[in-house]
């Protein structure tokens, strides 16, 4: 799998999309996980609804949301209020039983907020030891949530 780079601005929301063959993965739940080291396990961050038919409902874990367009074949992950520690390598996964197929490898890069004049020294970029030669960069145009905006539908 090639790695796709998504760049977002600190403090804003970053949307990551993972396209897939909807027939190949029909009926399968999806997940977003964070790669722990180059060869380490992929630690689950959030997964789609337990009932596959309800995969379109947005599920949150902390500041990370996931939703699945099972007909169109696009998994969408939203990282809200992006922080430097969110930078790193992730995977979109398709689940079947206890197995997980990788849909896409994603490198999240966090860029300094141009309006924030604090020291950007703690922002993460891949170092020389983490070169992604065939990485494809996607700039995600995102915005911060407006004041009072509800990030998920009310439960009533």
């Amino acid at each position: 799998h090639n790695t796709t780079v998504f760049q977002g601005v600190a403090g804003q929301s970053l949307q990551v999309s993972c396209p897939y063959d909807s027939m190949k993965h029909w009926g399968r739940r999806k997940a977003w996980c964070r790669q722990l080291g180059e060869k380490g396990p992929c630690q689950r961050v959030v997964s789609t609804h337990n009932l596959w038919l309800l995969s379109f409902l947005r599920r949150w874990n902390g500041s990370t949301a996931i939703t699945d367009d099972t007909l169109g074949g696009t998994l969408t992950i939203t990282l809200r209020n992006l922080q430097p520690h969110d930078a790193g390598l992730y995977q979109c996964q398709s689940l079947h039983g206890s197995e997980a197929d990788t849909l896409r490898k994603v490198l999240v890069e966090v860029l300094a907020d141009p309006l924030d004049h604090r020291d950007a020294g703690d922002l993460w970029f891949p170092g020389e030891s983490e070169s992604f030669e065939d990485a494809h960069v996607e700039h995600s145009i995102s915005r911060s949530l407006l004041e009072g905006e509800i990030p998920f539908p009310p439960t009533s």
Epitope: D21, M23, K24, R29, S47, N50, L51, H96, G97, S98
Partner: antibody
């Protein structure tokens, strides 16, 4: 009507190569997983592996990895099971089966009997 | 690999009676997250290819009579055939698909007394 039609019986000698086929019809061949299952004489079923013809994504059971090759040609809606050097222990009935993405098998071919004997 | 063990090996039944086949897995087939149990049942009638009877523990495949039912939890499973008919004879296999490689039980041969 969904159909999986397998190639006819084969009698081969040890060391020979062989490719058997499974032709799908009545559905979009590219869009469904297709598995191969072995049944040795008088024995049970063994899952060999599975392929998604749309992109040729293939998974093998460790017991069969390196022993056989699973492939598909979506242009002619046909999947293949291939041996480069047959052994007497390869004598069996081989079934192809159409799977869902969750890997249960709703349609089966009629089977191909492979006999390997010197 | 997950080992699937079926009992009995052979089951003689009288038409109209209920037959029960057991299947045990070496580890749990329950996905605790989605609540599904990844256990299926297949029937291979004499001289025929296998056919799907039950998938995901208890869902009947299309065209399968309601005389067939699957149940169980975790590692112990049962296929029940109520009001057994002559056409039900054959070898019944359980199969797990919670992890690769998919594995089948050794089979239970159902025959009419």
């Amino acid at each position: 009507e969904v159909q999986l039609v397998q190639s006819g019986s084969e009698v081969k000698k040890p060391g020979e190569s062989l490719r058997i086929s499974c032709k799908g019809s009545g559905y979009s061949f590219s869009s469904y997983w297709l598995a191969w299952v072995r049944q040795m004489p008088g024995k049970g079923l063994e899952w060999m592996g599975i392929i998604y013809p749309g992109d040729s994504d293939t998974r093998y059971s460790p017991s069969f990895q390196g022993q056989v090759t699973i492939s598909a040609d979506k242009s002619i809606s046909t999947a293949y099971l291939q041996w480069s050097s047959l052994k007497a222990s390869d004598t069996a009935m081989y079934y192809c089966a159409r799977g869902t993405p969750l890997f249960y098998f709703t349609y089966w071919g009629q089977g191909t009997l492979v006999t390997v004997s010197s | 690999d997950i080992v699937m063990t079926q009992t009995p090996l052979s089951l003689p039944v009288t038409p109209g009676e209920t037959a029960s086949i057991s299947c045990r897995s070496s580890q749990s087939l329950l996905d605790s997250e989605d609540g599904n149990t990844y256990l299926d049942w297949y029937l291979q009638k004499p001289g025929q290819s296998p056919q799907l009877l039950i998938y995901t523990l208890s869902y009947r495949a299309s065209g399968v009579p309601d005389r067939f039912s699957g149940s169980g939890s975790g590692t112990d499973f049962t296929l029940k055939i109520s009001r057994v008919e002559a056409e039900d004879v054959g070898v019944y296999y359980c199969m797990q698909r919670i992890e690769s490689p998919l594995t089948f039980g050794g089979g239970t041969k159902v025959e009419i007394k």
